[in-house]
């Protein structure tokens, strides 16, 4: 931003009432009057090259500082050519000093030059020559000096002329300020630019209303330039939330909008399932019967429960259940379902329930399932059993209602036992089984069907109680179909599959373990 | 015994609208999702729409969204599907089907055709 | 949308053959695929769910089997009155889309 400049003395503008002092008195330098555009034109000049040594000073009245630190001094001159003069005039000169002294009081005519400190010697870019002189076109010179820092109330300026032909036509005295600003959603307070042309002043701005500083952000800071020019901006504030940025302002969001942070994001339209927000929202409410996770972002659309999975099937293999269901078809708007699969047993006889988790296995835990089918095993024949799926979401936990769907199935058998050829001869094979533990005590007797492989009209039947059978006086070198089945109180239970072993040929002979 | 019979097929002009419905009897109508299916010229079925059994949740492809709403009306045991601006695309049997908790549409009606024409 | 992909538009048997009707989905849809039939001038009919699962009523010379992305829909002894378009879906995830149909043409 350009630099603010706050004049103290303009001598141009004041139209010749500021009445210089000149010393010394009604020698040297001298106040003139010209008209140039039909206006009068006043200026302090000094033309006495012809005279030898010259010693001439034309002071400022007392400039009160205020709040300046460096002031700025603009000179506005022309110089005519030494050489435009009879013989040169040996003792012309081309140039002028500039002076200055700070005072904490006027000193009024009273003027001393040893309280004076040189600032420069002033010369001219051109000089105004004769031919220029005559045609009165005159070269005007602009210099600017600086002088700084000052501490005392006030100062004066002050001209020497040394023997050159000078007019003086504006001297402006002025400070330097880094104007008000607006950045970054900050206000920067006008700050009076600093003496040393090195350092920068640090000026810390305010949030303008409704901005914050971000948190972990720096507060906004500038710096005020020798010059008046704000530089490295540092920090930023950021609207609120329920605010957006509006050219430098903070602007609350209209309704049906909203913003949830300090941020530089404009406002956003409250997003599917939620209320029309009331102006300057930092969130939009859900609609009944949706909601929000914890986790959810204020930008994502209010979700509810998923519905129950949406076709749940139970096929029953023997002592074991497949559960198949499909997603439901209500996902409730979001992506993170998860199944649960619970048990109940009833027994047919007393009508009798309850939970079954304890006595069945699941082929993997059956909380928080992501895949859709789930086998479970170990289940007691002749039980009925009710399987319920519950589907859930990152919302489930914010309602009472359970999304769920059953499946019952009868387990009518026990699981086919798994069969073993322990051992055999020429004449004999030894076959053991087991079925689950949960089952064993349902199971009377087992029964072993046996016959020779493609024998179809007769087969022998054995029953135990034990878990292994010798079947014996069998032909050697002879293929036996074998099948072992569990009876129960009620009846038969699933049979196993039929295998096939063989008896050792007699020069085999042995008892051989297989 | 379940029994779904369709009404309100016809003749209209593209941009027209027409009200489809869907009279449900032998179950209990509120216990069941229950959905719009078509048949095209071409033969080919596409789901139109979805009521679940409470109402509260409906659902439509791409292709009729915005124009096609399904409703239902439990105490008449109605199931309606209103469509507007139709489109030529539109033309093809309507039929109104229903689900098990196992196993999808075992239950259709005999449809009703729809005629989107200039 | 997953799609499902029937591969012939028309098969033409005869009466006693065996025949397989297949279909086949873009994604995987476990074993949730349906079939139905739809005889002329009639509505569709559910055959079979699960991939495998015969509806009430269904004469058990229909068959299917498949999990994943294929599946068979088998005909063990073609009828006469099996002459009908047969109709593969997917009712695993919503929206539940249909196969093109394969017609069953007698010779």
């Known amino acids: 931003a350009q630099g603010k400049e706050v004049v103290l003395l303009d001598f141009a503008a004041a139209g010749g009432e500021l009445g210089w002092l000149t010393h010394p008195y009604g020698k040297g330098w001298d106040l003139m009057q010209n008209i140039m555009n039909d206006m009068p034109i006043y200026m302090y000049s000094v033309c006495n090259v012809m005279s030898g040594d010259q010693d001439n000073w034309l002071r400022t009245n007392w400039v009160y500082r205020g709040e300046a630190e460096r002031i700025f001094i603009e000179l506005k001159f022309t110089v005519r050519d030494c050489n435009s003069f009879p013989g040169g005039a040996s003792s012309c000169k081309e140039t002028f000093n500039l002076y200055y002294a700070e005072s904490d009081l006027d000193y009024g005519t009273n003027f001393q030059k040893r309280l004076f400190t040189k600032i420069d010697t002033i010369a001219p870019d051109e000089i105004t020559v004769s031919s220029d002189f005559e045609a009165r076109h005159v070269k005007l010179n602009v210099e600017e000096r600086s002088v700084g820092p000052l501490t005392r109330k006030g100062f004066y300026l002050a001209f020497q002329d040394i023997g050159a032909c000078v007019a003086l036509l504006s001297v402006r005295v002025y400070y330097k300020k880094c104007p008000e600003l607006l950045q970054g959603l900050a206000h920067f307070p006008e700050t009076i630019a600093g003496s040393d042309a090195p350092s920068l002043a640090t000026v810390a701005g305010t949030c303008v209303d409704h901005a914050v500083v971000p948190p972990g952000g720096e507060e906004p800071r500038m710096h005020c330039a020798v010059d008046g020019e704000w530089l490295v901006p540092i920090g930023q504030c950021l609207c609120q939330a329920g605010y957006e940025k509006v050219e430098d302002a903070c602007q609350a969001c209209s309704p049906g909008f909203f913003k949830f942070e300090a941020s530089e994001s404009p406002c956003l339209e409250c997003p599917e399932h939620t209320l029309p927000s009331p102006e300057g929202a930092t969130s939009c409410e859900c609609e009944e019967g949706f909601f929000r996770a914890p986790q959810d972002p204020a930008s994502m659309p209010c979700t509810r429960p998923p519905s129950a999975p949406h076709y749940l099937t139970a096929v029953g293999m023997g002592a074991k259940v497949e559960l198949r269901w499909t997603p439901p078809q209500d996902s409730g708007g979001r992506e993170d379902i998860v199944y649960s699969v619970t048990c109940e047993q009833c027994w047919p006889e007393s009508g009798e329930c309850g939970p079954c988790e304890a006595s069945v296995r699941y082929s993997e835990p059956p909380h928080g399932l992501t895949r859709t089918s789930v086998t479970v095993s170990d289940l007691e024949p002749h039980m009925n059993y009710t399987f319920t799926v519950e589907a859930r979401n990152g919302v489930s936990g914010l309602v009472t209602s359970r999304s769920f769907r059953t499946a019952s199935v009868s387990i009518n058998q026990t699981e086919p036992p798994k069969v073993r050829l322990e051992g055999r001869s020429t004449t004999s094979l030894s076959v053991s089984w087991s079925i689950p533990p949960p089952q064993q005590s349902r199971v009377w007797k087992y029964e072993v069907t046996y016959r020779k492989k493609g024998d179809s009209n007769s087969y022998n039947v054995r029953r135990t109680e034990g878990f292994s059978v010798t079947l014996d006086d069998l032909a050697p070198d002879t293929t036996y179909l074998v099948q072992v089945q569990a009876l129960t109180q009620e009846g038969q239970g699933a049979g196993s599959k039929v295998h096939e072993f063989q008896t050792l040929s007699p020069e085999g002979s042995g008892n051989l373990a297989v | 015994e379940v029994q779904l019979v369709e009404s309100g097929g016809g003749s209209v002009k593209p941009g027209g609208s027409l009200k489809l419905s869907c009279a449900a009897s032998?179950?209990?109508?509120?216990?069941?999702?229950m959905y719009w299916v078509r048949q095209t010229p071409e033969k080919r079925l596409e789901w139109v729409a979805t009521?679940?059994?409470?109402?509260?949740?409906?659902s439509y492809p791409d292709s009729v969204k915005g124009r096609f709403t399904i409703s239902r009306d439990i105490a008449k045991n109605n199931l309606y599907l209103q469509m507007s601006s139709l489109k030529s695309e539109d033309t093809a049997m309507y039929y109104c089907t229903r689900d098990e908790s196992d196993r999808p549409f075992p239950y259709w009606g005999q449809g009703t055709l729809v005629t989107v024409s200039s | 949308d997953i799609v499902l992909t029937q591969s012939h538009r028309s098969m033409s048997t005869s009466v006693g053959d065996r025949v397989n009707i297949t279909c086949k989905a873009s994604q995987d849809v476990t074993t949730a695929v349906a079939w139905y039939q739809q005889k002329p001038g009639q509505s569709p009919k559910l055959l079979i769910f699960?991939?495998?699962t015969r509806h009430a009523g269904v004469p058990d010379r229909f068959t299917g089997s498949g999990s994943g992305t294929d599946f068979t829909l088998t005909i063990s002894s073609v009828q006469a009155g099996d002459l009908a378009l047969y109709y593969c879906?997917?009712?695993?995830?919503?929206?539940?889309?249909f196969g093109g149909g394969t017609k069953l043409e007698i010779k």
């Open positions: 699960w991939a495998s």
């Open positions: 009521i679940s059994d409470g109402g509260s949740f409906t």
């Open positions: 879906q997917q009712h695993y995830s919503t929206p539940y889309t």
């Open positions: 032998g179950f209990t109508f509120t216990d069941h999702y």
